[in-house]
């Protein structure tokens, strides 16, 4: 037998004028269901039957995956980072082939000293994480290395990281201009050749909540948008309440369709409501129209 569920019906009229009846289930009554037919066809919009219920794909939900969610989870990374590829020339150490071997005493000591020097240079930059030597070559010692920067994700993370990369450039330029060999003498932890300082490349984490929102919304991408609350991005449709872009359906229910959000207006015992925002009420008995 098919499921028999006690139902009370509320009549909903779309803003175009058609009346839709939506069942509201009386959950106090025990429900017994026995589904007849092929379950695969029951799950719409790419959803699949797991033996108990439809497993819906984003952005769908509902018994048959026929409804569109009002908000989609988007998860920006906790932190975002930048990697700067730099080259400096250290003049206070003689190059030997042993520096090529990362397990040698020469490399370990050079790495330790260089890292300590850079930690001092960049100590005032909150985003600074550390340095990583990628290659050492002759001339005295040409040090190819990465400067790693990291910050908490905020909507302005790109600006924060861009600013930090500028400060890195300023600080490395300053130290490699000031800490130089004078009369074959270096009175610093490390000395440099000013002309050997170069920024080769800067890579910044790319995270765009709008792009993630659009991708997850699929064919509804034009109707979902990103709004921020406490610097956290939310991917919402106009049917999600409490945001600037929220649609006010007054005496109605917001529903997403492939043409965007629309209001389904309710008909009560005393009134029927119409209009794009279901804000035009007409009294049934007197046919009195008011706003």
């Amino acid at each position: 037998p098919l499921a028999t569920i006690p139902v009370s019906t509320t009549s909903l009229t779309s803003s175009e004028g058609s009346t839709i009846s939506t069942p509201s289930v009386d959950i106090s009554t025990p429900v017994t269901t026995s589904i007849v037919g092929d379950q695969c066809s029951r799950c719409k919009n790419g959803g699949f039957w797991d033996g108990l219920k439809c497993q819906c794909l984003t952005p769908y939900y509902g018994e048959s995956c026929e409804e569109v969610v009002n908000s989609i989870d988007i998860a920006p990374p906790e932190t975002v980072s930048a990697q700067m590829e730099l080259t400096v020339t250290v003049t206070s150490v003689k190059f030997t082939d042993e520096l090529k071997n990362h397990s040698s005493q020469e490399f370990r000591e050079f790495n330790k000293t260089f890292t300590e020097q850079m930690n001092i240079v960049y100590s005032g930059i909150p985003e600074y994480v550390g340095v990583n030597i990628t290659n050492l070559r002759l001339g005295s010692v040409v040090v190819e290395h990465d400067v790693l920067l990291r910050t908490k994700y905020t909507p302005e993370y790109k600006t924060a990281l861009d600013n930090a990369t500028e400060v890195v450039k300023q600080k490395i330029t300053k130290v490699t201009t000031e800490q130089i060999m004078t009369n074959d003498n270096c009175s610093a932890l490390m000395c440099f050749n000013t002309t050997g300082t170069q920024v080769q490349n800067i890579t910044v984490t790319q995270y765009d909540p709008v792009e993630e929102c659009r991708q997850k919304a699929e064919e509804y991408e034009d109707y979902f948008l990103v709004e921020y609350r406490d610097q956290k991005p939310y991917c919402i449709s106009p049917c999600e309440s409490g945001f600037n872009a929220s649609k006010n359906c007054n005496h109605g229910k917001c529903q997403m369709s492939q043409n965007g959000a629309r209001c389904l207006c309710v008909t009560t015992e005393t009134h029927w409501y119409s209009g794009e925002d279901c804000n035009q009420g007409t009294q049934k008995s007197h046919h009195h129209h008011h706003h």
Epitope: T91, M181, D184, N185, S187, L189
Partner: nanobody, 124 residues
Amino acid sequence: EVQLVESGGGLVQPGRSLRLSCAASGDITRRCMGWFRQAPGKEREGVAGISEDGITGYADSVKGRFTISRDNAKNSLYLQMNSLRAEDTALYYCAASILNRVGCRQLSYEYIYRGQGTMVTVSS
């Protein structure tokens, strides 16, 4: 890691001499070596430095009185201190640079290894 152990400190009268030694656990051939000192309540100061090829440098306060030398075969560093003064009283320790360090006959940069020190007290 290079371990450095100083010896030769002690109590000496003004005008007398002392010879400090520093024994290194590893090869010091390609390292700059130096002596530093720190008097109670004062900043650490460089006393003398020597490059791997034997070029030396001294603090103005000890020039003509102290001599730094090294014996690479013995992995040892020495500081001959003559005409000692009360103001030479301090903890003296030896230090070793990064391998293949150049331009290091002066003393204001940081060495990467240093010993625990030996106390020199100049008093009558």
